[in-house]
Amino acid sequence: LVVTPPGPELVLNVSSTFVLTCSGSAPVVWERMSQEPPQEMAKAQDGTFSSVLTLTNLTGLDTGEYFCTHNDSRGLETDERKRLYIFVPDPTVGFLPNDAEELFIFLTEITEITIPCRVTDPQLVVTLHEKKGDVALPVPYDHQRGFSGIFEDRSYICKTTIGDREVDSDAYYVYRLQVSSINVSVNAVQTVVRQGENITLMCIVIGNEVVNFEWTYPRKESGRLVEPVTDFLLDMPYHIRSILHIPSAELEDSGTYTCNVTESVNDHQDEKAINITVVESGYVRLLGEVGTLQFAELHRSRTLQVVFEAYPPPTVLWFKDNRTLGDSSAGEIALSTRNVSETRYVSELTLVRVKVAEAGHYTMRAFHEDAEVQLSFQLQINVPVRVLELSESHPDSGEQTVRCRGRGMPQPNIIWSACRDLKRCPRELPPTLLGNSSEEESQLETNVTYWEEEQEFEVVSTLRLQHVDRPLSVRCTLRNAVGQDTQEVIVVPHSLPFK
């Protein structure tokens, strides 16, 4: 490969244009930051391949490594690659931006690392500091790479001066993990048991052939020793397991169980602990509260959820009006109880496309041989209001009446309003609210009926208008917690011959 200009380091002017050429006996390509920038590839008559990379309007951000490499399916040797480093001194760019990955450096052992703070100008003096200190650290700097050395578990920043302006880099964080070469995990078949049941714990070590297990447990403190069993898990390399089994647990066996593992070759050790609770008898406890009145909206789906703790696992039943519920074949009701942790459960009743008939008294009961709990609530089905009728009449008494009838659940409120200027109202002028005002212009009479079978309220409201001297748009609006509906009618004076 032949690169012109050959480098290996170039310093170019900001805003300038520069051409890099690479040629070779096979197809060649320029790479920048693991990508191929736009370039012109050609093949000469003598069989030489070339690629021309034109860098236009250069800025400091063009500073960095450029590689020319063979672009050949024959897979030529990887060392057949030329590196060129370009600086574009740019006073507007302090330190070159880093990817997030470069700001965090993770180590497990003492080894040389590089803090990759780079500038656009190879003439700049760059110093390294602990983030909390001013003293420059005596670490060698390479303008193309950054500071390389052995670093403590601290945070660092680089500093430089551009003109008369001091510039700081982003902070770099060195994380050193003091790794134990032993990885221990402890788990229990159950962390909650009843007295008389068994406690079984497992301590597993990975990646070590020769280890020693030592268990600490409440019974041991009273001098009652239990002999653990150690085995090798054959399906996994070097997984060694120690099993501690305590039959017929007593209340005094509650407490912390610790597995300590030592490896004598490198004198490493690690330990993990787990808490075991022995209860006198099983329990079921509700967690959180569910209000005694719940709501669902007609034709929408509603999930009612109860969270509880129990040991041992309970049976869960749901009832509606004292009749047992089950998953319906039509898919209208779905029941599920999930075990979300060892002793925590979530039971859900889902009503699909709720119907009026599903209002009623619901109970969830969770029980086993030792305990039970139940939770009850009333389910109200909310029905959006609708205006069923809006009619106008003018009896002989001379007044005119408008009757509005509608239904909904919960009980709808009724609002009467009128517009006298039909051209401008309601867009430009707000409608006037009507009702039992001190002026005797209008009177209102409203009756409410609850229909037991449909489980909703019916509102009938009659508006009496004393004298109507010009056409009037009267609007009846019904509103409740889940919606509103409006209808309007034009009321004309008696004197007008048309309606």
Epitope: F106, K131, K132, D153, R154, S155, Y173, V174, R176, L177
Partner: nanobody
Framework: QMQLVQSGAEVKKPGASVKVSCKAS????????IQWVRQAPGQGLEWMGW????????YFAQKFQGRVAMTRDTSINTAYMELSSLRSDDTAVYYC?????????WGQGTLVTVSS
Amino acid sequence: QMQLVQSGAEVKKPGASVKVSCKASGYTFTDYYIQWVRQAPGQGLEWMGWINPDSGGTYFAQKFQGRVAMTRDTSINTAYMELSSLRSDDTAVYYCATHGGDRSYWGQGTLVTVSS
């Protein structure tokens, strides 16, 4: 004293997901990023990404994008890392870590074993 305590070991089947928790104490949880790093048996440390507990903003290493989620619950000072579509080469000890400026602080590690 800053401290991070992680959830216990997990054994999962290929294709499953695992969610590891990391509870912080001894400092203001929202002041420092939480990093997630893993170490497979016999390998070095591999950075997975970070979460800013203050805003909930995250940044993931390209290798894990689309497969990892990092969340936090500031009410209980806990960060979570969930890795989905587990493969056998995801068997590793997963660590959370944070940096107090003067030094780093690490969780005790959570061993995740992926085995059919």
